[in-house]
Amino acid sequence: SQVSQNCHNGSYEISVLMMGNSAFAEPLKNLEDAVNEGLEIVRGRLQNAGLNVTVNATFMYSDGLIHNSGDCRSSTCEGLDLLRKISNAQRMGCVLIGPSCTYSTFQMYLDTELSYPMISAGSFGLSCDYKETLTRLMSPARKLMYFLVNFWKTNDLPFKTYSWSTSYVYKNGTETEDCFWYLNALEASVSYFSHELGFKVVLRQDKEFQDILMDHNRKSNVIIMCGGPEFLYKLKGDRAVAEDIVIILVDLFNDQYFEDNVTAPDYMKNVLVLTLSPGNSLLNSSFSRNLSPTKRDFALAYLNGILLFGHMLKIFLENGENITTPKFAHAFRNLTFEGYDGPVTLDDWGDVDSTMVLLYTSVDTKKYKVLLTYDTHVNKTYPVDMSPTFTWKNSKLPNDITGRGPQ
């Protein structure tokens, strides 16, 4: 049914879906705080621009009795139930900030006439790519794939002189929501990653992973996995690892590696960690005080969603344009706006661009060091440490195929 949008006459509302099933197990109170902090900033920015309007958020909670698993994999119907609730109440904002689970976002996008923008903190899966009115404020799987292919092909860096074309992917099904979809994208036979690699095998059992570490007949020296160092240790322990094994640990939303007092444990010496360049101003923020480093990005995405709406609202109001039009719904892409922690860039499909950072463990200092950075916006790698103190022979990354050492 046609739902009227509370989005005119100087009063603009944001519908925030507060779902029990969420990409990160974050107390809804923390997300409310993030949204409210964002609203304060937006009101100030609009006031500064001479726009005397009201901006509010309505928090829509799902029925916890029905949807209480907290697990994204059972989230498909929750988003639709919330939309039904909005429909019954005949109360929809100018924008929907909500579902973070790939399943619920995909289903909501499929089953509704989206004449309003949808902003998601999550929705990492490939099935949420290229959606015309969906904006994603946390790095989706597509961006990870493009980095990996770029890095695999790189062969003209002093510390990486071989192109790689093979990989193992460890995926045991217990991953967090972000990791689940990142690895799902790497596993998919029709994905860009699979298309560009000559050999790729998914390891699903702990023992498979453990056996590969010293298997002389392995088909690749490179293993991709997703999670934190503790996750790797649970799996790998102190087992011996062949000297030309490279483990790529995808841990995007974790800035603990950049903390001053962090020392890399010995089991990380064969590991390259892929993470995001850390923010700086969040540490003292009122909404982030209670957040762990891994949760900051999630709350920040909610906050930035509010700021993005404020940015677009300001532009449309200044141009005298209507907010409840398809033009507004399709405008949340191919732009840069002032986020909470600095400029945020969205690509042509409304997905956030970021700087990914590849870290290695220095054998000298036992510290995590930046090896290179990757700008997802231009799909380009920038070497940082030109003299890495690697564990690998000659301080160069080995070939991905067993039996051929660094040249």
Epitope: D156, L157, P158, T161, P383, V384, D385, M386, S387, S395
Partner: antibody, heavy 119, light 107 residues
Framework: QVQLVESGGGVVQPGRSLRLSCAAS????????VHWVRQAPGKGLEWVAV???????DYNAAFISRFTISRDNSKNTLYLQMNSLRAEDTAVYYC?????????????WGQGTLVTVSS | DIQMTQSPSSLSASVGDRVTITCRAS??????LNWYQQKPGKAPKLLIY???RLQSGVPSRFSGSGSGTDFTFTISSLQPEDIATYYC?????????FGQGTKVEIK
């Protein structure tokens, strides 16, 4: 003997372009990364760009939009294409070959070529 | 980007004196620190690489030490031919960067 010889410097008007060359001899040019380093009159040394043996190019961010480094291994020559030149680009431009990985020192330098940007 | 700060910017010493120049990096560069000598109108010449390794053909009166962020370059007994400007350079991360130079003169 092992040497690098720059050429192509001279006086050029602001906004114009210039291409510098650096001829290498006495060593296997294609095996080495080679750099451009510049020095404004009375000032210190400033790293401009490198082209690695594999062909990858990296720049000082200050020059990435206006300068392009390239090489022709068949001619044992390094180039620096400089566009939209400004008065502050006035400097002696040196090409230099670096040492072996992972020691990025400049072991071999050319004699330099002076570029003067003036109207 | 890593900033390299040299001190002093100039010094005057007598022949036979021990001369010390310091170089500080804005972040840890391990031992990837090199020293050059440049005489007026000439190209720089490599003296020391990787903090303390003497380049072939360079007199043993030149030496270097340090690690991490703080480095020292020493001429144990200054000679007239050592009159020049000396530069440190980090070779750890791109963009490679130089100190602003120390001009050494004879009293």
């Amino acid at each position: 003997q092992v040497q690098l010889v720059e050429s192509g410097g001279g006086v050029v008007q602001p906004g114009r372009s210039l291409r510098l060359s650096c001829a290498a001899s006495g060593f296997t040019f294609s095996n080495y990364g080679v750099h451009w380093v510049r020095q404004a009159p009375g000032k210190g040394l400033e790293w401009v760009a490198v082209i690695w043996s594999g062909g990858r190019k990296d720049y000082n961010a200050a020059f990435i939009s206006r300068f392009t480094i390239s090489r022709d291994n068949s001619k044992n020559t390094l180039y620096l294409q400089m566009n939209s030149l400004r008065a502050e680009d006035t400097a002696v431009y040196y090409c230099a070959r670096h040492g072996t990985y992972p020691y990025w020192y400049f072991a071999l330098w050319g004699q330099g070529t002076l570029v003067t940007v003036s109207s | 980007d890593i900033q390299m700060t040299q001190s002093p910017s100039s010094l005057s010493a007598s022949v036979g004196d021990r001369v010390t120049i310091t170089c500080r990096a804005s972040q840890d560069i391990s031992n990837y620190l090199n020293w050059y000598q440049q005489k007026p109108g000439k190209a720089p010449k490599l003296l020391i690489y990787y903090t303390s390794r003497l380049q072939s053909g360079v007199p043993s009166r030149f030496s270097g030490s340090g690690s991490g962020t703080d480095f020292t370059f020493t001429i144990s007994s200054l000679q007239p031919e050592d009159i020049a400007t000396y530069y440190c350079q980090q070779g750890k991360t791109l963009p490679f960067s130089f100190g602003q130079g120390t001009k050494v003169e004879i009293k």
